[in-house]
Interface confidence: low
């Protein structure tokens, strides 16, 4: 396994309606042509999987099982929104790149994108 | 009403290829994956990948990778699946089935199985 | 990958009792789907996201289920039920399924 440079924005404010979008970027050594990214939050002390996307260079991301992601690629930079936030999501978002295919295997992990989520006041009358 | 009409049965050598086909009909292709699961007779499902067929981008199970190639016909609204290199062990029930979104169910649909023997 | 265990492998049971069968992931998946199998038809979709009942399935099916464990139950069994169950994970790739545990008649 070969380590590989990722980076992403350090903070990230989600909007009223609980939507953070951020880049992930990669430094590739070499041609990848199958790319996998997973996002992964951190938050006291432990690490869950949030999402994850395999990809071809070149094409669309796809999320499994109404994943709360979504996702764009162009060239070495993958576009990321994340969905349905509340305030209790708030935590460091970390973007893990693996390139696939083909061989040699390489392993690039973010240093993560605070993410910050602020539950909008609930209007007067309203149910939400 | 979705239908997925699979091609007919296949008798192939050790060694030799097969492409199947797969032809959807009553909703938009390009609106959902299609993807290929195959069962060896009397086993359980085993997925080999998926294919959207707006973007051809592919996603593949490695133990396929290099000896399945999935591809699409927009045109005609048909996927197709060649595997290379066949192997006695590789004589199963190959199945198209379609992917759905956060509306439909995914693998709702499928086709009616397309048999591959290998056998010298 | 995520290996998915069912259990039991072979169920056998009378028209009229419960059924219960269950499945066991290697590690947590968000949802658990399930298939029923009849010998030489293509598998049907049973129940999604680990409770949705698929158009047309009677409601004495129903899932449960979170993280490692989920559970296929149905409720009285009919003639029609005998068959082969699968479930199967979407949560990453590759797509697995469960090895089957086939519901016959005792």
């Known amino acids: 396994c070969k380590a590989m440079h990722v980076a992403q924005p350090a903070v990230v404010l989600a909007s009223s309606r609980g939507i953070a979008s951020f880049v992930c970027e990669y430094a590739s050594p070499g041609k990848a042509t199958e790319v996998r990214v997973t996002v992964l939050r951190q938050a006291d002390s432990q690490v869950t999987e949030v999402c994850a996307a395999t990809y071809m260079m070149g094409n669309e991301l796809t999320f499994l099982d109404d994943s709360i992601c979504t996702g764009t690629s162009s060239g070495n930079q993958v576009n990321l929104t994340i969905q349905g936030l509340r305030a209790m999501d708030t935590g460091l978002y970390i973007c893990k790149v693996e390139l696939m295919y083909p061989p040699p295997y390489y392993l690039g992990i973010g240093n993560g994108t605070q993410i910050y989520v602020i539950d909008p006041e609930p209007c007067p009358d309203s149910d939400f | 009403e979705v239908q997925l009409v699979q091609s007919g049965a296949e008798l192939k050598k050790p060694g030799a290829s097969v492409k199947m086909s797969c032809k959807a009909s009553g909703y938009t292709f390009t609106d959902y994956n299609m993807d290929w699961v195959r069962q060896a007779h009397g086993k359980g499902l085993e997925w080999i990948g998926n294919?959207?067929?707006?973007?051809?981008?592919?996603s593949y199970n490695q133990k396929f990778k290099g000896r399945a190639t999935l591809t699409v016909d927009k045109s005609s609204s048909t996927a197709y699946m060649e595997l290379r290199s066949l192997r006695s062990d590789d004589t199963a029930v190959y199945y198209c089935t379609r992917d759905g979104n956060r509306y439909d169910a995914w693998f709702a649909y499928w086709g009616q199985g397309t048999l591959v023997t290998v056998s010298s | 990958e995520i290996v998915l265990t069912q259990s039991p492998a072979t169920l056998s049971l009378s028209p009229g009792e419960r059924a219960t069968m269950s499945c066991s992931a290697s590690s947590s998946v968000t949802y658990m789907h399930w298939f029923q199998q009849k010998p030489g038809k293509a598998p049907k979709l049973l129940i999604y996201s680990t409770s949705i009942l698929a158009s047309g399935v009677p409601a004495r099916f129903s899932g449960s289920g979170s993280g490692t464990d989920y559970t296929l139950t149905i409720s009285r069994l009919e003639p029609e039920d005998f068959a082969t169950y699968y479930c199967?994970?979407?949560?990453?790739?590759?797509?697995?399924f469960g090895q089957g545990t086939k519901l016959e008649i005792k």
């Open positions: 199967q994970q979407r949560t990453s790739y590759p797509l697995t």
């Open positions: 294919i959207n067929p707006n973007s051809e981008s592919t």
